[in-house]
Amino acid sequence: AGVFELQIHSFGPGPGPGAPRSPCSARLPCRLFFRVCLKPGLSEEAAESPCALGAALSARGPVYTEQPGAPAPDLPLPDGLLQVPFRDAWPGTFSFIIETWREELGDQIGGPAWSLLARVAGRRRLAAGGPWARDIQRAGAWELRFSYRARCEPPAVGTACTRLCRPRSAPSRCGPGLRPCAPLEDECEAPLVCRAGCSPEHGFCEQPGECRCLEGWTGPLCTVPVSTSSCLSPRGPSSATTGCLVPGPGPCDGNPCANGGSCSETPRSFECTCPRGFYGLRCEVSGVTCADGPCFNGGLCVGGADPDSAYICHCPPGFQGSNCEKRVDRCSLQPCRNGGLCLDLGHALRCRCRAGFAGPRCEHDLDDCAGRACANGGTCVEGGGAHRCSCALGFGGRDCRERADPCAARPCAHGGRCYAHFSGLVCACAPGYMGARCEFPVHPDGASALPAAPPGLRPGDPQRYL
């Protein structure tokens, strides 16, 4: 886990001729704010795709009023950093979109109006824990200067925030096989949750240090396929010493589960599904209340204040069962495309892609774009054996060579007027409507009928989903 931090240094006219007009005027004072959208790895920069790594919105900047006759200066900026927390590993390569928004503070009916001034996008390589990286991006006549970094939240460390650190228990050395946590030399790597080297495909753990194997696999790290060729009978459980399915009674023979629990075989043992009010390896623990902490894997316990009343466990994603004791096989939904191998890591799903495919779900065909070029800043997107270009704003066609008329599709709703603009299009809404496409009616009380805001946006913020 960690935080991506973005510091905006300046937003103003870029170098060269054709300085932009100030976005604010004496009649229409305004202020700026910024939105950042992050996506992992080689994802498309298309504005519509979700901000899978997260998004953040800045505070509003100071109110600015243009001085008549003066050229547009660098505009006053909001204070502070934009911070995008990430829960899993930092991916190393990421795509970003930074939008500059204008909030007009004139006598608007129904409150302030927002419009998108500029959008910049890029793809970068960045290691967590490194220094601030500086960048300059241009959007039409505007120029945005900013810095960014990714930092890990303790106890995570490393370039991907995947190693854990904790204070050393002894002054001079770390635990067996563990290294000091540079640059925190007074701390040590914490042991991995599972046994170090435990196969992510075929092993899992429920306690630190364990490496329990899925059916068909054996060995200390679950890397050895079970061989049935030298066995008398294809019945479990798996023998630790031979790596062979050995004959013998099944682990559920005689039902080891007490109090009406039902038994099911697992690769190495058995598992009891207990009726409510009982838990434990064999459903032997009874009279349970929430005070006993019967919900596993971060489940939330509700009810059951006294032993006679039942409790209910509300399970977090990925777990089920009356005590959240069962891991959901999320790979059964076959989320990986193009023959990719699905890995359920507990905290996340990962797809291991076949050669020639990439992307979080193996959805990108890597060969399609070989030797292809998209003009005017367009990005080549793989898929289905034929490349296509995701064009920069203002361009279209198969190779982004044609100037697009963004207003041709009449995108402004409710009688709004469309203006072609360097960053796409701008809608001037008819009275009583607001939003990037004039899609939201303004209520008489000043509130807007906006849909539920995505993370990082409050209702009432610009509904320009990326």
Epitope: S169, A170, S172, R173, C174, G175, P176, G177, L178, P191, L192, R195, A196, G197, Q207, P208, G209, E210, T218, G219, P220, L221, T223, V224, A240, T241, G243
Partner: antibody
Framework: QVQLQQSGAELMKPGASVTLSCKAT????????IEWVKQRPGHGLEWIGE????????NYNEKFKGKATFTADTSSNTAYMQLSSLTTEDSAIYYC??????????WGQGTTLTVSS | DIVLTQSPATLSVTPGDSVSLSCRAS??????LHWYQQKSHESPRLLIK???QSISGIPSRFSGSGSGTDFTLTINSVETEDFGMYFC?????????FGGGTKLEMK
């Protein structure tokens, strides 16, 4: 400093049982495996098995099943190996070692067991 | 059980020489092979883990290579403190097994 401190030498009679201890200092046991290894002159090193303290996980070499039993007390940071029905073949140096993977990263100084009538 | 065969059984060298010790497995152990040094009346000490990973505190003259069934421990420019027994160990499957050892002695 990471150390595994093993109990002292033992002289036992055939048929008896003995419990050897291995106390870890410099880190806490849960999450790390304790491995037990036997060394006899002319027989090299033999892996007896392993235990994950704080859990029910243990793996035994088939050859030592019924001979060795592993336990651990996480409150005292100590692992134990009981050897039963001793014979002269059990005379050896017994090492404990610690790991969070499968390499034997740190070793105790060894306990010499002599079985003699 | 997986059998590890070390060769040669004894290696006589002069300080300053570079030597290679071999460990061959009866079946593939992937890279789950580790090397240990044991001096007389001392406990074994881990030198290399997972075939080629170096260990903090172990001199850089020790290096490991190989995967599958054939592995090599190389000592560049042997020093007098390096004499003793060297064992390989596989942890790809239970039971873990050790090689019979190579004795490195002074010529």
């Amino acid at each position: 400093q990471v150390q595994l401190q093993q109990s002292g030498a033992e002289l036992m009679k055939p048929g008896a049982s003995v419990t050897l201890s291995c106390k870890a200092t410099g880190y806490t046991l849960p999450g790390y495996w304790i491995e037990w290894v036997k060394q006899r002159p002319g027989h090299g090193l033999e892996w007896i098995g392993e235990i994950l303290p704080g859990s029910s996980s243990a793996n035994y070499n088939e050859k030592f099943k019924g001979k060795a039993t592993f336990t651990a007390d996480t409150s005292s940071n100590t692992a134990y190996m009981q050897l039963s029905s001793l014979t002269t073949e059990d005379s050896a140096i017994y090492y404990c070692a610690s790991t969070y993977g499968t390499s034997l990263d740190y070793w105790g100084q060894g306990t010499t067991l002599t079985v003699s009538s | 059980d997986i059998v590890l065969t070390q060769s040669p059984a004894t290696l006589s060298v002069t300080p300053g020489d570079s030597v290679s010790l071999s460990c061959r497995a009866s079946q593939s152990v992937s890279n789950d092979l580790h090397w240990y040094q044991q001096k007389s009346h001392e406990s074994p000490r881990l030198l290399i883990k997972y075939a080629s990973q170096s260990i903090s505190g172990i001199p850089s003259r020790f290096s490991g290579s190989g995967s599958g069934t054939d592995f090599t421990l190389t000592i560049n420019s042997v020093e007098t403190e390096d004499f003793g027994m060297y064992f390989c160990q596989q942890s790809n499957n239970w039971p873990y097994t050790f090689g019979g050892g190579t004795k490195l002695e002074m010529k």
